[in-house]
Amino acid sequence: KESCDVQLYIKRQSYHSIFAGDPFKLECPVKYCAHRPQVTWCKLNGTTCVKLEGRHTSWKQEKNLSFFILHFEPVLPSDNGSYRCSANFLSAIIESHSTTLYVTDVKSASERPSKDEMASRPWLLYS
């Protein structure tokens, strides 16, 4: 029997290599059974995850999964960092793994590095 617990399908240690100035959609895939839970995004600041208020978010529905989307319009260098989505379900909080945005500021990059080059430069997180 399928579990009816809410599940948030963000892979552990996942990341996205993106560029400042581009639009980007960060998706939180949500599995639920009857009632869609309330979902929020937060950004990690050390060990604290700070709720993102007043940001453009939307839902996308697919066959057996819903996606809670955080929109970056456009991506800013300050969007660099790790994000987590959380679902409020039956008075419990279910947290996703964090996913990291590696943002390259195109002003300072002579050419766009590849995904693999980005992933091998984790210090970009702290620049």
Partner: antibody
Amino acid sequence: EVQLVQSGAEVKKPGESLKISCKTSGFNIKDTYIHWVRQMPGKGLEWIGRNDPANGNTKYSPSFQGQVTISADKSISTAYLQLSSLKASDTAMYYCASYEGYYERFGYWGQGTLVTVSS
Amino acid sequence: EIVLTQSPGTLSLSPGERATLSCRSSQSLLDRDGKTYLNWLQQKPGQAPRRLIYLVSKLDSGIPDRFSGSGSGTDFTLTISRLEPEDFAVYYCWQDTHFPYTFGQGTKLEIK
């Protein structure tokens, strides 16, 4: 039935390159990370790197960075390990492993591909 | 990188006995999500490894319950409560908390 079926044994000459495949079935490859692991004759296991078939993102061990290329084609549920400029010291068994990316609820291993590099 | 040190290198026991294998990490394997990503693998001669235990103590599907894992932080143990003939093999611990992921050097469990 869950399966990870790797391509067959290879004998190569130094300087040549090689691409090993790992065909998965019985689960959605997009829900996993595909790892590649080396085992030299009579030795232990060494982690080469990991690919996320959902988006192509790859992480390498510093020991293997620049020597190998890991990739996947999610449309045919197959992962690849490319070895370039082969040396005799690349002679080893190479394994793929598929671990569920969310909660690690499964961890399956391929049968291994024996690569022999000899002049 | 994280160094995993397994002990003993070789363990000689008889069927029916209890086996205790150790894996010590050079740093804590506790991830920031509060979980500890430490696996135990079994490898028999001429075969691929197979996962026995993940997240320190969770038993893989189809693995007999005579296998158990315990520990936290930097010290981990694989216990086989009552050895069966098919348990004699090489056992590896593997951490996938910190990049690059690393394996222990293995413990060979042999028949006494």
